[in-house]
Protein backbone atom coordinates (compact mmCIF):
# COMPACT_ATOMS: atom_id res chain seq x y z
CA UNK A 1 0.00 0.00 0.00
CA UNK A 2 2.74 2.49 0.90
CA UNK A 3 4.43 1.79 -2.43
CA UNK A 4 1.19 2.80 -4.17
CA UNK A 5 1.13 5.97 -2.08
CA UNK A 6 4.51 6.93 -3.52
CA UNK A 7 3.30 6.38 -7.07
CA UNK A 8 0.27 8.61 -6.34
CA UNK A 9 2.60 11.28 -4.98
CA UNK A 10 4.64 11.15 -8.19
CA UNK A 11 1.41 11.46 -10.17
CA UNK A 12 0.39 14.55 -8.16
CA UNK A 13 3.85 16.01 -8.72
CA UNK A 14 3.41 15.58 -12.49
CA UNK A 15 -0.13 16.99 -12.48
CA UNK A 16 0.76 20.19 -10.62
CA UNK A 17 3.64 21.04 -12.98
CA UNK A 18 1.21 22.70 -15.37
CA UNK A 19 -0.65 24.59 -12.64
CA UNK A 20 0.02 27.66 -10.61
CA UNK A 21 -0.78 26.78 -7.02
CA UNK A 22 1.16 29.03 -4.67
CA UNK A 23 -0.08 27.41 -1.45
CA UNK A 24 2.39 26.83 1.33
CA UNK A 25 1.80 23.65 3.29
CA UNK A 26 2.75 22.54 6.79
CA UNK A 27 5.67 20.21 6.22
CA UNK A 28 7.66 17.97 8.52
CA UNK A 29 11.01 17.74 6.76
CA UNK A 30 12.87 15.98 9.57
CA UNK A 31 10.54 13.30 10.89
CA UNK A 32 11.57 11.60 14.08
CA UNK A 33 10.64 7.89 13.94
CA UNK A 34 8.68 8.22 17.19
CA UNK A 35 6.51 10.93 15.60
CA UNK A 36 5.97 9.46 12.15
CA UNK A 37 2.27 8.63 12.62
CA UNK A 38 1.50 12.15 13.85
CA UNK A 39 3.49 13.64 10.96
CA UNK A 40 1.72 11.42 8.44
CA UNK A 41 -1.68 12.63 9.64
CA UNK A 42 -0.53 16.22 9.11
CA UNK A 43 0.71 15.40 5.61
CA UNK A 44 -2.63 13.79 4.75
CA UNK A 45 -4.62 16.84 5.82
CA UNK A 46 -2.29 19.27 4.02
CA UNK A 47 -2.53 17.22 0.85
CA UNK A 48 -6.20 18.16 0.71
CA UNK A 49 -5.25 21.84 0.44
CA UNK A 50 -3.79 21.01 -2.98
CA UNK A 51 -7.10 19.42 -3.94
CA UNK A 52 -9.12 22.34 -2.60
CA UNK A 53 -7.08 24.94 -4.48
CA UNK A 54 -6.51 23.16 -7.77
CA UNK A 55 -10.11 22.46 -8.78
CA UNK A 56 -8.66 19.76 -11.04
CA UNK A 57 -10.55 16.46 -11.22
CA UNK A 58 -7.40 14.36 -11.79
CA UNK A 59 -5.68 15.89 -8.76
CA UNK A 60 -8.83 15.49 -6.69
CA UNK A 61 -9.12 11.79 -7.60
CA UNK A 62 -5.43 11.06 -7.03
CA UNK A 63 -5.39 12.85 -3.67
CA UNK A 64 -8.48 10.95 -2.58
CA UNK A 65 -7.01 7.62 -3.70
CA UNK A 66 -3.79 8.38 -1.81
CA UNK A 67 -5.73 9.23 1.36
CA UNK A 68 -7.68 5.96 1.13
CA UNK A 69 -4.45 3.98 0.77
CA UNK A 70 -2.59 5.85 3.51
CA UNK A 71 -5.43 5.79 6.05
CA UNK A 72 -5.87 2.06 5.49
CA UNK A 73 -2.15 1.50 5.93
CA UNK A 74 -2.15 3.68 9.05
CA UNK A 75 -5.14 1.98 10.63
CA UNK A 76 -2.98 -0.68 12.31
CA UNK A 77 -0.93 1.90 14.23
CA UNK A 78 -2.99 5.07 13.74
CA UNK A 79 -4.41 4.87 17.26
CA UNK A 80 -0.96 4.91 18.84
CA UNK A 81 -0.49 8.00 20.99
CA UNK A 82 2.84 9.62 20.21
CA UNK A 83 3.94 12.14 22.82
CA UNK A 84 6.18 15.16 22.43
CA UNK A 85 5.41 15.54 18.73
CA UNK A 86 4.77 18.85 16.99
CA UNK A 87 1.20 19.82 16.17
CA UNK A 88 0.54 20.33 12.46
CA UNK A 89 0.43 24.12 12.94
CA UNK A 90 3.90 24.10 14.50
CA UNK A 91 5.52 22.67 11.40
CA UNK A 92 7.35 24.77 8.85
CA UNK A 93 5.40 26.02 5.85
CA UNK A 94 6.95 24.93 2.58
CA UNK A 95 6.01 25.17 -1.08
CA UNK A 96 4.25 22.27 -2.79
CA UNK A 97 7.39 20.86 -4.38
CA UNK A 98 9.22 20.64 -1.04
CA UNK A 99 6.08 19.34 0.66
CA UNK A 100 5.77 16.45 -1.81
CA UNK A 101 9.48 15.60 -1.48
CA UNK A 102 9.17 15.42 2.31
CA UNK A 103 6.01 13.37 1.93
CA UNK A 104 7.90 10.79 -0.14
CA UNK A 105 10.57 10.61 2.60
CA UNK A 106 8.07 9.89 5.36
CA UNK A 107 6.33 7.23 3.25
CA UNK A 108 9.73 5.58 2.76
CA UNK A 109 10.11 5.52 6.56
CA UNK A 110 6.87 3.55 6.76
CA UNK A 111 8.02 1.20 3.99
CA UNK A 112 11.33 0.57 5.75
CA UNK A 113 9.68 -0.32 9.03
CA UNK A 114 6.85 -2.47 7.67
Amino acid sequence: NWVNVISDLKKIEDLIQSMHIDATLYTESDVHPSCKVTAMKCFLLELQVISLESGDASIHDTVENLIILANNSLSSNGNVTESGCKECEELEEKNIKEFLQSFVHIVQMFINTS
Epitope: C42, E64, N79
Partner: antibody, heavy 125, light 111 residues
Framework: QVQLVQSGAEVKKPGASVKVSCKAS????????ISWVRQAPGQGLEWLGW????????KYAQKFQDRVTMTTDTSTSTAYMELRSLRSDDTAVYYC??????????????????WGQGTMVTVSS | QSVLTQPPSASGTPGQRVTISCSGS????????VYWYQQLPGTAPKLLIY???RRPSGVPDRFSGSKSGTSASLAISGLRSEDEADYYC???????????FGGGTKLTVLG
Protein backbone atom coordinates in the same frame (compact mmCIF):
# COMPACT_ATOMS: atom_id res chain seq x y z
CA GLN B 1 -19.37 15.94 -7.83
CA VAL B 2 -19.34 15.79 -4.04
CA GLN B 3 -22.86 15.98 -2.65
CA LEU B 4 -24.52 15.61 0.75
CA VAL B 5 -28.27 14.98 0.80
CA GLN B 6 -30.11 15.24 4.10
CA SER B 7 -33.37 13.74 5.34
CA GLY B 8 -36.63 15.70 5.38
CA ALA B 9 -38.10 18.11 7.89
CA GLU B 10 -39.16 16.82 11.31
CA VAL B 11 -41.67 18.03 13.91
CA LYS B 12 -41.04 16.77 17.44
CA LYS B 13 -42.50 17.26 20.90
CA PRO B 14 -40.35 18.55 23.78
CA GLY B 15 -38.47 15.70 25.45
CA ALA B 16 -38.42 13.57 22.28
CA SER B 17 -35.40 12.67 20.13
CA VAL B 18 -34.65 13.35 16.48
CA LYS B 19 -32.27 11.54 14.13
CA VAL B 20 -31.15 13.38 10.99
CA SER B 21 -29.40 11.57 8.15
CA CYS B 22 -26.85 12.83 5.64
CA LYS B 23 -26.11 10.70 2.58
CA ALA B 24 -22.82 11.37 0.81
CA SER B 25 -21.95 10.76 -2.83
CA UNK B 26 -19.17 11.68 -5.24
CA UNK B 27 -16.29 10.87 -2.89
CA UNK B 28 -14.90 8.15 -0.66
CA UNK B 29 -17.12 8.74 2.37
CA UNK B 30 -15.15 6.49 4.71
CA UNK B 31 -11.88 8.40 4.30
CA UNK B 32 -13.04 11.73 5.72
CA UNK B 33 -15.11 13.29 8.48
CA ILE B 34 -18.51 14.92 8.81
CA SER B 35 -19.28 17.96 10.97
CA TRP B 36 -22.75 18.96 12.06
CA VAL B 37 -23.79 22.61 12.39
CA ARG B 38 -27.19 24.08 13.26
CA GLN B 39 -28.92 27.41 12.65
CA ALA B 40 -31.90 28.56 14.70
CA PRO B 41 -34.43 30.73 12.81
CA GLY B 42 -32.91 34.14 12.09
CA GLN B 43 -29.78 33.21 14.08
CA GLY B 44 -26.16 32.35 13.37
CA LEU B 45 -24.34 29.05 12.94
CA GLU B 46 -23.49 26.74 15.83
CA TRP B 47 -21.17 23.72 15.64
CA LEU B 48 -22.50 20.54 17.26
CA GLY B 49 -19.60 18.18 16.64
CA TRP B 50 -17.55 16.02 14.29
CA UNK B 51 -17.31 12.33 13.45
CA UNK B 52 -14.65 10.51 11.48
CA UNK B 53 -16.26 8.18 8.97
CA UNK B 54 -12.92 6.37 8.83
CA UNK B 55 -12.58 5.27 12.44
CA UNK B 56 -15.71 6.49 14.25
CA UNK B 57 -13.89 9.00 16.45
CA UNK B 58 -16.19 11.77 17.64
CA LYS B 59 -15.78 15.19 19.19
CA TYR B 60 -18.89 16.95 20.46
CA ALA B 61 -19.30 20.58 21.45
CA GLN B 62 -19.43 20.85 25.25
CA LYS B 63 -22.91 22.33 25.10
CA PHE B 64 -24.34 19.19 23.42
CA GLN B 65 -22.04 16.56 24.91
CA ASP B 66 -24.73 14.81 26.96
CA ARG B 67 -27.54 15.00 24.36
CA VAL B 68 -25.98 14.29 20.97
CA THR B 69 -24.76 11.11 19.28
CA MET B 70 -23.13 11.03 15.86
CA THR B 71 -22.72 7.82 13.90
CA THR B 72 -21.89 6.69 10.38
CA ASP B 73 -22.82 3.76 8.19
CA THR B 74 -20.03 3.29 5.67
CA SER B 75 -21.99 0.65 3.74
CA THR B 76 -24.50 3.32 2.71
CA SER B 77 -22.17 6.37 2.96
CA THR B 78 -24.54 7.94 5.45
CA ALA B 79 -23.89 10.00 8.58
CA TYR B 80 -26.45 10.38 11.37
CA MET B 81 -26.91 12.94 14.11
CA GLU B 82 -29.27 12.15 16.97
CA LEU B 83 -30.29 14.85 19.44
CA ARG B 84 -32.18 13.80 22.58
CA SER B 85 -34.30 15.56 25.21
CA LEU B 86 -35.41 18.15 22.70
CA ARG B 87 -36.42 21.63 23.84
CA SER B 88 -38.12 24.43 21.94
CA ASP B 89 -34.79 26.22 21.54
CA ASP B 90 -33.50 23.22 19.54
CA THR B 91 -35.78 24.35 16.71
CA ALA B 92 -33.31 24.96 13.90
CA VAL B 93 -32.03 23.91 10.50
CA TYR B 94 -29.42 21.18 11.00
CA TYR B 95 -26.63 20.92 8.43
CA CYS B 96 -24.01 18.27 7.78
CA UNK B 97 -20.78 19.23 6.04
CA UNK B 98 -17.84 17.28 4.72
CA UNK B 99 -14.83 17.75 6.96
CA UNK B 100 -11.37 16.74 5.68
CA UNK B 101 -10.35 15.46 9.12
CA UNK B 102 -10.28 11.69 9.51
CA UNK B 103 -8.17 11.89 12.69
CA UNK B 104 -8.72 14.16 15.72
CA UNK B 105 -5.38 15.97 15.40
CA UNK B 106 -6.35 17.13 11.88
CA UNK B 107 -9.44 18.94 13.15
CA UNK B 108 -7.76 22.25 14.02
CA UNK B 109 -6.74 22.82 10.39
CA UNK B 110 -9.91 21.52 8.78
CA UNK B 111 -12.79 23.28 6.98
CA UNK B 112 -16.40 22.53 6.06
CA UNK B 113 -17.03 21.99 2.35
CA UNK B 114 -19.50 21.22 0.89
CA TRP B 115 -22.63 21.36 3.06
CA GLY B 116 -25.89 19.42 2.91
CA GLN B 117 -29.09 21.28 2.04
CA GLY B 118 -30.20 21.32 5.69
CA THR B 119 -32.97 19.64 7.68
CA MET B 120 -35.55 21.74 9.52
CA VAL B 121 -36.31 20.37 12.98
CA THR B 122 -39.23 21.99 14.78
CA VAL B 123 -39.77 21.31 18.47
CA SER B 124 -43.24 22.26 19.57
CA SER B 125 -45.86 21.00 21.98
CA GLN C 1 -16.78 30.61 26.03
CA SER C 2 -14.84 32.17 23.17
CA VAL C 3 -16.65 34.77 21.10
CA LEU C 4 -16.14 36.18 17.62
CA THR C 5 -17.80 39.54 17.06
CA GLN C 6 -19.13 40.63 13.67
CA PRO C 7 -21.19 43.70 12.77
CA PRO C 8 -24.80 42.57 12.24
CA SER C 9 -25.09 44.37 8.93
CA ALA C 10 -23.08 45.96 6.11
CA SER C 11 -24.04 47.50 2.81
CA GLY C 12 -22.64 48.88 -0.40
CA THR C 13 -23.58 49.76 -3.95
CA PRO C 14 -22.64 47.70 -7.03
CA GLY C 15 -18.96 48.12 -7.92
CA GLN C 16 -18.00 49.29 -4.44
CA ARG C 17 -15.55 47.63 -2.06
CA VAL C 18 -17.01 46.43 1.24
CA THR C 19 -15.19 45.10 4.29
CA ILE C 20 -16.65 42.90 7.02
CA SER C 21 -14.77 42.57 10.29
CA CYS C 22 -14.50 39.70 12.76
CA SER C 23 -12.85 40.35 16.09
CA GLY C 24 -11.85 38.04 18.89
CA SER C 25 -9.96 38.19 22.15
CA UNK C 26 -6.23 38.87 22.32
CA UNK C 27 -5.30 35.24 22.73
CA UNK C 28 -7.47 33.55 20.13
CA UNK C 29 -7.36 35.05 16.65
CA UNK C 30 -3.61 35.68 16.76
CA UNK C 31 -2.77 32.00 16.90
CA UNK C 32 -5.68 30.47 15.05
CA UNK C 33 -6.83 30.62 11.46
CA VAL C 34 -10.01 32.40 10.46
CA TYR C 35 -12.45 30.93 7.93
CA TRP C 36 -15.27 32.71 6.10
CA TYR C 37 -18.54 31.18 4.92
CA GLN C 38 -21.11 32.76 2.61
CA GLN C 39 -24.79 31.92 3.01
CA LEU C 40 -26.99 33.07 0.16
CA PRO C 41 -30.69 33.56 1.04
CA GLY C 42 -32.45 30.23 1.62
CA THR C 43 -29.35 28.11 0.95
CA ALA C 44 -26.68 26.25 2.91
CA PRO C 45 -23.42 28.00 3.78
CA LYS C 46 -20.47 27.75 1.38
CA LEU C 47 -16.73 27.92 2.13
CA LEU C 48 -15.40 31.25 0.88
CA ILE C 49 -12.01 31.77 2.55
CA TYR C 50 -9.95 29.34 4.60
CA UNK C 51 -6.81 29.79 6.69
CA UNK C 52 -7.18 33.57 6.91
CA UNK C 53 -6.71 34.43 3.26
CA ARG C 54 -6.75 31.40 0.98
CA ARG C 55 -9.48 30.93 -1.61
CA PRO C 56 -10.79 27.53 -2.66
CA SER C 57 -10.89 26.95 -6.40
CA GLY C 58 -13.99 28.54 -7.91
CA VAL C 59 -14.19 31.46 -5.49
CA PRO C 60 -13.71 34.72 -7.42
CA ASP C 61 -10.67 36.82 -6.53
CA ARG C 62 -13.03 39.69 -5.69
CA PHE C 63 -13.20 38.01 -2.28
CA SER C 64 -10.14 38.34 -0.06
CA GLY C 65 -9.37 37.62 3.57
CA SER C 66 -6.84 39.19 5.90
CA LYS C 67 -5.94 39.17 9.56
CA SER C 68 -4.14 41.60 11.78
CA GLY C 69 -3.69 41.07 15.50
CA THR C 70 -7.03 40.21 17.06
CA SER C 71 -9.17 41.12 14.06
CA ALA C 72 -9.85 39.45 10.73
CA SER C 73 -11.53 40.98 7.69
CA LEU C 74 -13.32 39.84 4.58
CA ALA C 75 -13.14 42.28 1.69
CA ILE C 76 -15.39 42.13 -1.34
CA SER C 77 -14.40 44.34 -4.24
CA GLY C 78 -16.49 45.11 -7.32
CA LEU C 79 -19.64 44.37 -5.34
CA ARG C 80 -22.42 42.58 -7.23
CA SER C 81 -26.08 42.04 -6.45
CA GLU C 82 -25.45 38.29 -6.15
CA ASP C 83 -23.08 38.97 -3.21
CA GLU C 84 -26.11 39.84 -1.06
CA ALA C 85 -25.88 37.18 1.64
CA ASP C 86 -24.97 36.44 5.25
CA TYR C 87 -21.24 36.12 5.93
CA TYR C 88 -19.87 34.16 8.89
CA CYS C 89 -16.35 34.00 10.26
CA UNK C 90 -15.23 30.90 12.16
CA UNK C 91 -12.18 29.62 13.97
CA UNK C 92 -11.11 26.54 15.88
CA UNK C 93 -10.77 27.00 19.63
CA UNK C 94 -7.88 24.72 20.54
CA UNK C 95 -8.52 24.97 24.28
CA UNK C 96 -12.05 23.64 23.89
CA UNK C 97 -11.38 21.63 20.73
CA UNK C 98 -14.47 23.22 19.22
CA UNK C 99 -15.38 25.30 16.19
CA UNK C 100 -16.77 28.73 16.96
CA PHE C 101 -18.72 30.92 14.54
CA GLY C 102 -19.18 34.68 14.58
CA GLY C 103 -22.72 36.00 14.80
CA GLY C 104 -22.84 36.68 11.06
CA THR C 105 -23.08 39.85 8.97
CA LYS C 106 -25.97 40.49 6.60
CA LEU C 107 -24.64 42.20 3.48
CA THR C 108 -27.11 44.28 1.49
CA VAL C 109 -26.31 45.47 -2.02
CA LEU C 110 -28.12 48.79 -2.50
CA GLY C 111 -29.66 50.09 -5.69
Amino acid sequence: QVQLVQSGAEVKKPGASVKVSCKASGYSFSSFGISWVRQAPGQGLEWLGWISAFNGYTKYAQKFQDRVTMTTDTSTSTAYMELRSLRSDDTAVYYCARDPAAWPLQQSLAWFDPWGQGTMVTVSS
Amino acid sequence: QSVLTQPPSASGTPGQRVTISCSGSTSNLKRNYVYWYQQLPGTAPKLLIYRDRRRPSGVPDRFSGSKSGTSASLAISGLRSEDEADYYCAWYDRELSEWVFGGGTKLTVLG
